[in-house]
């Protein structure tokens, strides 16, 4: 028996469902009482779902799994994760066996986008050209770990001066917070892109200082 | 069974660089971030850097060694890497390669045996 | 950045007693603290994460609690392998990672 899964990963959205695909060419006259199919965690051999004896055995996994089984007879042999969690990430291992056995890895990959970074200055008044101040760009709840950009008006990278912390939550989802420290000009506009590397989702936040009143 | 290997200590005088290398192996190691952490002797544990999982490579590096190191993996090899430049003799110490928990969880889960860096003039 | 206190610095108790070590953090890290043993010339070994989680291979006589800013590890009775450094880690907000300065369990 051959095991054939997806080569690339599966991306999923956190609380959204992910299907991991894994299939197999069943021979002429296969019976669901000739397959053991097992699914457990590549690295650590825990044990997520199988189908031994004839009968779906169940979710060993947090009951947020199940197969296909309307298609298990045709070979279609995919595991349904619900409500994807930052925890679910990684390789998950397909076997497959009936006569003789094979086995397959697909990997999960979780994400959740980064919200519309809200950008904080401080000081925030009585503000002049060649003062130092600080500004804050945070964005909130995104997963994987998000890189961060700030740039000024003309699009110039701003490079020193930056301190960027993650901070993940219970859930794993990760708060960024990003502090750049500039000499004011006579007026300019300061932007922080927050990038998911996974998703490929830019969220943006400005400040732009002329003189007074502040624009974000 | 999870194993991490560390190699490319020695003695080195300061200013000089000095590569790091950890081998992976027993998980699979792209889908984790990975830690360089350093004990001076007699000391309690710093962490000195930290890179992301996969090929994204997002990278984290404590003050003390922030412009002197760098960190880099090779996802083929599964390795680890750190370059040393513009050694001091305060970073002399075992330096220990440690796997991430999880990617969201930085807690250690695996250490290896770790690599004396000894600097001194 | 996030500075953890632990206390005491040492801790010498004999064999099937009790310990307790604590750790104090300088603002809330959550629940996102580890624990790590660490005997002389080896690597650091995870018992505790999450606060309060053991990892594998960890024996039950080790527990950790807290959240916030106080936590500890409660050791029910020591054996003599448990003698060592003791260190705790937040992971809460970085970089940087930080760990505390280590508590020791010594025979007495």
């Known amino acids: 028996v051959e095991v054939q899964v997806s080569e690339d990963p599966v991306v999923a959205l956190v609380d959204t469902d992910a299907t991991l695909r894994c299939s197999f060419s069943p021979e002429p006259g296969f019976s669901l009482a000739q397959l053991n199919l097992i699914w457990q965690l590549t690295d650590t051999k825990q044990l997520v779902h199988s189908f031994t004896e004839g009968r779906d055995q169940g979710s060993a996994y947090s009951n947020r799994t199940a197969l296909f089984p309307d298609l298990l007879v045709q070979g279609n042999a995919s595991l349904r994760l619900q409500r994807v969690r930052v925890t679910d990430e990684g390789s998950y291992t397909c076997f497959v066996s009936i006569q003789d056995f094979d086995s397959a890895a697909v990997s999960l990959q979780v994400a959740a986008p980064y919200s519309k970074p809200s950008m904080t200055l401080e000081p925030n008044k009585d503000l002049r050209p060649g003062n130092m101040v600080t500004i804050t760009c945070s964005s909130y709840q995104g997963y994987p770990e998000a890189e961060v950009f700030w740039k000024d008006g003309q699009g110039v990278p701003l490079t020193g001066n930056v301190t960027t912390s993650q901070m993940a939550n219970e859930r794993g989802l990760f708060d960024v917070h990003s502090v750049l420290r500039v000499v004011l000009g006579a007026n300019g506009t300061y932007s922080c892109l927050v990038r998911n590397p996974v998703l490929q989702q830019d969220a943006h936040g400005s400040v732009t200082i002329t003189g007074q009143p502040l624009t974000f | 069974d999870v194993q991490l290997v560390e190699s490319g200590g020695g003695v080195v005088r300061p200013g000089e660089s000095l590569r790091l290398s950890c081998a992976a192996s027993g998980f699979t190691f792209s889908n984790y971030a990975m830690n360089w952490v350093r004990q001076a002797p007699g000391e309690g544990l710093e962490w000195v850097s930290r890179i992301n999982y996969k090929g994204y490579n997002i990278t984290y590096y404590a003050d003390s060694v922030k412009g002197r190191f760098t960190i880099s993996r090779d996802n083929s090899k599964n390795t680890l890497y750190l370059q040393m430049n513009s050694l001091r003799a305060e970073d002399t110490a075992v330096y220990y390669c440690a796997k991430s928990g999880s990617n969201s969880n930085n807690f250690f889960d695996y250490w290896g045996l770790g690599t004396l860096v000894t600097v001194s003039s | 950045e996030i500075v953890l206190t632990q206390s005491p610095g040492n801790l010498s108790l004999s064999p099937g007693e009790r310990a307790t070590l604590s750790c104090r953090a300088s603002?809330?890290?959550?629940?996102?603290l580890g624990w790590y043993q660490q005997k002389p010339g080896q690597a650091p070994r995870l018992l505790i994460y999450?606060?309060?989680t053991r990892a594998t291979g960890i024996p039950d006589r080790f527990s950790g609690s807290g959240s916030g800013t106080e936590f500890a590890l409660t050791i029910s009775s020591l054996q003599s392998e448990d003698f060592a450094v003791y260190y705790c880690?937040?992971?809460?907000?970085?970089?940087?990672?930080?760990f505390g300065g280590g508590t020791k369990v010594e025979i007495k």
């Open positions: 603002q809330s890290v959550g629940s996102q």
């Open positions: 999450g606060a309060s």
């Open positions: 880690q937040q992971y809460y907000d970085w970089p940087p990672l930080t």
